[in-house]
Amino acid sequence: CKAMHVAQPAVVLASSRGIASFVCEYASPGKATEVRVTVLRQADSQVTEVCAATYMMGNELTFLDDSICTGTSSGNQVNLTIQGLRAMDTGLYICKVELMYPPPYYLGIGNGTQIYVIDPEPCPDSDF
């Protein structure tokens, strides 16, 4: 197994609809054809898997149907979008990239993107 550099933004603010997007870029040392991308969340001394997708270079990322993540790939960049976020989901979201095929296997882990989620204030009742 070999190490690989992964870059991602330090901070992202989720939209009022609970959507956060960020780019995960990896420095591919070779010509990988099969790539696995995993989003991890670190909070309260625990790391949990948020979502994961394996894709063939040149093809779209395919997350599971019930996944809160969607994404697109372009070269060595993956554009990730996480939906359905609430204030309690604020945390450090880490991009993990694995070059699965062909060998050798490469593993890269980003420094994490701190995603801040602010629940919208409920609208006051209108007199109209």
Partner: nanobody, 126 residues
């Protein structure tokens, strides 16, 4: 709240083997840096081995190199210390320690640890 629990200690003859397990209760050890320390009576506590959060890096004290092997079993939420060719001087209480580092350090062992288990006694004697 994560707690570390060691098991697998016991009495073994010189040249024998033991397999120590460090298990987490109340959480997972995924991406944690895990270390094994030992303390013999009247001696300082010393770090025996450690494994990085990714499992790609392992370190060993000179006194156990080639005899001890540390590994992760994430499916069972445990870290194993396989101890072979045991000697009388390996007799000690063995402690599992852990720390969840920033992701930028997941490929490294921790310099210090937040969490300590209660320890398991290893006695090597004929």
């Amino acid at each position: 709240e994560v707690q570390l629990v060691e098991s697998g200690g016991g009495l073994v003859q010189p040249g024998g083997s033991l397999r120590l397990s460090c298990e987490a209760s109340g959480g997972t050890l995924d991406y944690w840096s895990i270390g094994w320390f030992r303390q013999a009576p009247g001696k300082e506590r010393e770090e025996v081995s450690c494994i990085s959060g990714t499992g790609l890096r392992t370190n060993y004290a000179d006194s156990v190199k080639g005899r001890f092997t540390i590994s992760r079993d994430n499916s069972k939420n445990t870290v194993i210390l396989q101890m072979n060719s045991l000697r009388a001087e390996d007799t000690a209480v063995y402690y599992c320690t852990g720390k969840l580092l920033h992701p930028s350090l997941w490929s490294a062992c921790a310099n210090e640890y937040d969490l300590w288990g209660q320890g398991t006694q290893v006695t090597v004697s004929s």
